[in-house]
Interface confidence: low
């Protein structure tokens, strides 16, 4: 190899050992018979020399310097050449520097042609290598910028005072320009503006100077975004740290088109704005910081560009204004779909302020909009709190819980809502009246309705939850004996279309000892399935639960247990059902924890199921599940 | 009911490949994502990445880039997963397990196939 | 990627003791954690699933809670056969983790 340097060119060469390697044969440079592990070339030398061993590239690199000096006299500006040529170097890993020095009143811009720059952080790479190191100057500190790739958005870079640029080739990449352009502009006044252009959906992650480590004190660095006129950007911080002030506060500052407020100033921790339509610049200004524990400032931030759904242009209105104890939540659900870019999903209150997820709270009027390429990729949850503190006043009140209209004027699709029914203790019951009949589901007739009730105790000591329920059946009502919370969970889109169905009016009862009452009227055309509940967990301990099931005067019933026994074994306590005709008053009872469960029995009137628990041991529930037939009478036994 | 049924163990040696099926029954191979975990010997579980069985792509997490090929024949209801220029640290128990859309825990899970690299 | 750091890894305990595992998460996941139990030489099976819900079929005596980076498996009483390996899986984002497992053995 050869490689000779005009004298006039500023530019030196060094060969040196790179990352040591557990290669056991060792390599050398070899000049003029001489054996050495460094050299280096200066301006007006010319040196011819080889290596000892087949793959230098493993135990070599080669730096090449160019110092540019524009204090003294013009800079040679524009595109940026890499001398020597990369012809006629080793193949080696190389890094070409330029260290450009400039006064503080001259502005330098760096100029990447396409495919523009992408910022990476610690602990990353790029994926050909090819990585450009940027610095800057600060009176004699030096002020990392940042590293960069190929394919990014990154346009130009300005600083002033001086740029210091490392471009980074592994030995096999066979480019032979650096890619970059040098330009003089007016000083910036402040340490950088970095430029960054979108040409379509993306996303950019972009670090404050110095990152991983702390932004110069009481310094002011810009990143101005350039954004098709038909998207949308939105800011997210993915990590920062704030330093510890003396004066002033650290800030990021936004100029936002259209917006009567410029700069928006935020601090670090609030929600960045999102759903930005066209150009923007983003500032990070730091502070004069406590001498004796500065703590450090920085800031890793994403920038989310994308095309506005149709509903990201409407304003959609949720009126909580007239409802008390009541949040809207709309969050992301857990999506299986997944490719290269994730467009952001994101719900803007005001159209400003976006997040992945949001929650309104009753009493106002709340303004939302979407910046989202897919709406399914959202849903709703609702809760509202209905609660009677003064028995007098509540008892035999009736409210409607049904899902209120404007939720279904939303893009998104409601997952639950949830009522908690809240009564004061041992003073009121709740019944709950459907709309339509209500079916329990069970694995052997399971709901196949858009959407179902999921009713539970709404006390945290209890475990207990009574079953899922849809429209369909016989359940005509259900009492329970306190406070309950009632889920309407949907299943599919097609609920607004099933809304209709849904409604369920609660009163407030007296009350009753019992933990749940069933009222059941049965269906000519087919069986119906109840099961205790917290099926698969087993009735709580000393639970008591009935079923009052209506046999019409034409009609006889017959009551099937799905098991011969229970297999509940009682600690302390008896578990024991009975069965009780309505007109005669006659019962019988059954030893849950010791007889077998009766045969399939007919009964002609309307009757009472009920089961009581004792204390299970573990592992030894009370679960019961039963069905109801209805045939018609053959003979009149009235 | 459902099942996920996975082909035998196989002994390869460094540099070869394999190729490791999973066949699905008991119900709609498309409804469901599926996913490869792989557990080397005495270690933990490690997620390797899935296969959207609607449309065929795979997602693969990073130390499962480059070797490592998810692929689907829906006609016959079967997965697959193929890794290529074996090494000995590939020897481990490969599982496929069902996914769920909108839902992503693993409630079906193949008995697993062990694949041992060595010279 | 979203690290999952299960305590202990080795928990000793007599059939009939209570049993709890922790899982905790390098960062917020609400609720998208699952746990498994595998026994030897065979394949995980799903116990619990976001954090707290049930899984049908799986005995009673398991529960889980937790949500944000902290979360819990319970039995509230250990049978002999629970004697196993338990993972928790994070489902919040790709790539899905797991935890290292915590051994449950017998005392």
């Known amino acids: 190899f050869e490689i000779a340097l005009p004298r006039e060119s500023n530019i030196t060469v060094l060969i040196k050992l790179g990352t040591p390697t557990l290669l056991a044969k060792p390599c050398y440079i070899v000049i003029s018979k001489r054996h050495t592990t460094m050299l280096s070339i200066k301006p007006g030398e010319r040196i011819l020399f080889t290596f000892s061993c087949q793959s230098p590239e493993n135990h070599f690199v080669i730096e090449i310097q160019k110092n540019i000096d524009c204090m003294s006299g013009p800079c040679p500006f524009g595109e940026v050449q890499l001398q020597p040529s990369t012809s006629l170097l080793p193949t080696l890993n190389r890094t070409f520097i330029w260290d450009v020095k400039a006064h503080k009143s001259i502005g330098l811009e760096l100029q990447f042609s396409i495919p523009r720059l992408r910022q990476f952080g610690p602990g990353e790479s790029c994926p050909d290598g090819v990585t450009y190191s940027i610095s800057g100057r600060i009176d004699a500190t030096v002020v990392r910028i940042g590293t960069f790739c190929s394919n990014g958005t990154v346009s130009r870079i300005k600083m002033q005072e001086g740029v210091k640029m490392a471009l980074h080739l592994p030995w096999f990449h066979p480019r032979n320009v650096s890619g970059f352009s040098i330009a003089n502009r007016s000083s910036i006044k402040r340490l950088c503006i970095i430029e960054s252009v979108f040409e379509g959906e993306g996303s950019a992650t972009l670090m404050s100077a110095n990152y991983p480590e702390g932004f110069p004190e009481d310094e002011l660095m810009t990143w101005q975004f350039v954004i098709p006129a038909h998207l949308r950007a939105s800011v997210s911080f993915l990590n920062f740290n704030l330093s510890n002030c003396e004066r002033k506060e650290e800030r990021v500052e936004y100029y936002i088109p259209g917006s009567t407020t410029n700069p928006e100033v935020f601090k670090l921790e609030d929600k960045q704005p999102g759903n930005m339509a066209g150009n923007f610049n983003l500032s990070l200004q730091g502070c004069d910081q406590d001498a004796q524990n500065p703590g450090i400032l920085r800031l890793q931030f994403q920038v989310l560009v994308q095309h506005p759904q149709n509903e990201s242009n409407k304003i959609y209105v949720v009126d909580l204004s007239n409802e008390r104890a009541t949040s809207l939540t709309i969050e992301p659900r857990p999506v299986k779909q997944s490719r290269k870019f994730v467009p952001g999903c994101f719900v803007c209150l005001e159209s400003r302020t976006c997040s992945t997820n949001l929650t309104l709270t009753s009493g106002s009027k709340h303004k939302i909009s979407f910046l989202c390429d897919n709406l399914t990729r959202l849903w709703m949850n609702v809760e509202k709190n209905i609660s009677c503190t003064d028995h007098r006043y509540c008892q035999r009140k009736s409210y409607s819980l049904q899902v209120p209209s404007d939720i279904f004027h939303l893009p998104v699709e409601l997952h639950d809502f949830s009522w908690k029914l809240l009564v004061p203790k041992d003073r009121l019951s709740l019944v709950l009246v459907p709309a339509q009949k209500l079916q329990q589901h069970t694995h052997e007739k399971p709901c196949n309705t858009s959407f179902s009730y999921l009713v539970a105790s709404a006390i945290p000591s209890q475990d207990l939850y009574f079953g899922s329920f849809c429209p369909g059946g016989s359940i005509e009502q259900i009492q329970v004996k306190q406070n309950i919370s009632v889920t309407l969970r949907t299943f599919a889109p097609s609920f607004r279309q099933e809304a209709s169905r849904q409604g369920l009016t609660v009163s407030f009862i007296p009350y009753f000892k019992e933990e749940g009452v069933f009222t059941v009227t049965p269906d000519t055309k087919s069986k119906v399935y109840l099961r205790t509940p917290n099926w698969d967990r087993g009735l709580p301990s000393l639970t008591s639960v009935s079923w009052n099931i209506s046999v019409p005067r034409d009609q006889v019933a017959c009551l099937t247990f799905f098991k011969e026994r229970t297999g509940v074994v009682c600690q302390t306590g008896r578990a024991f059902m009975i069965i009780q005709e309505q007109r005669t008053r006659a019962e019988e009872i059954f030893s849950l924890d010791e007889d077998a469960l009766p045969k399939p029995r007919f009964h002609h009137h309307s009757f009472w199921v009920n089961i009581s628990n004792c204390s299970p041991a573990s592992g030894k529930q009370l679960d019961l599940l039963f069905w109801v037939t209805l045939t018609p009478r053959t003979v009149d036994l009235t | 009911q459902v099942q996920l049924v996975q082909s035998g163990s196989e002994l390869k040696k460094p540099g070869a490949s394999v190729k490791v099926s999973c066949k699905a029954s008991g119900y709609t191979l498309t409804d469901f994502s599926m996913h490869w975990v792989r557990q080397a010997p005495g270690q933990g579980l490690e997620w390797m990445g899935w296969i959207n069985t609607e449309t065929g792509a795979p997602t693969y997490a990073d130390d499962f880039k480059g070797r490592f090929v998810l692929s689907l024949d829906t006609s016959v209801s079967t997965a697959y997963l193929q890794i290529s220029s074996l090494k000995a640290e590939d020897t481990a128990v490969y599982y496929c397990?069902?996914?769920?859309?909108?839902?992503?825990?693993?409630?079906?899970w193949g008995q697993g196939t062990l694949v041992t690299v060595s010279s | 990627e979203i690290v999952l750091t299960q305590s202990p890894a080795t928990l000793s305990l007599s059939p009939g003791e209570r049993a709890t595992l922790s899982c905790r998460a390098s960062q917020s996941i609400s609720d998208f954690l699952h746990w498994y139990q595998q026994k030897s030489g065979q394949s995980p099976r799903l116990l619990i699933k976001?954090?707290?819900q049930s899984i049908s079929g799986i005995p009673a005596r398991f529960s889980g809670s937790g949500s944000g980076s902290d979360f819990t498996l319970t039995i509230s009483s250990v049978e002999p056969e629970d004697f196993a390996v338990y993972y928790c899986q994070s489902a919040h984002s790709f790539p899905y983790t797991f935890g290292q497992g915590t051994k449950l053995e017998i005392k």
């Open positions: 397990s069902r996914g769920r859309d909108y839902d992503p825990h693993f409630d079906y």
């Open positions: 976001y954090a707290s």
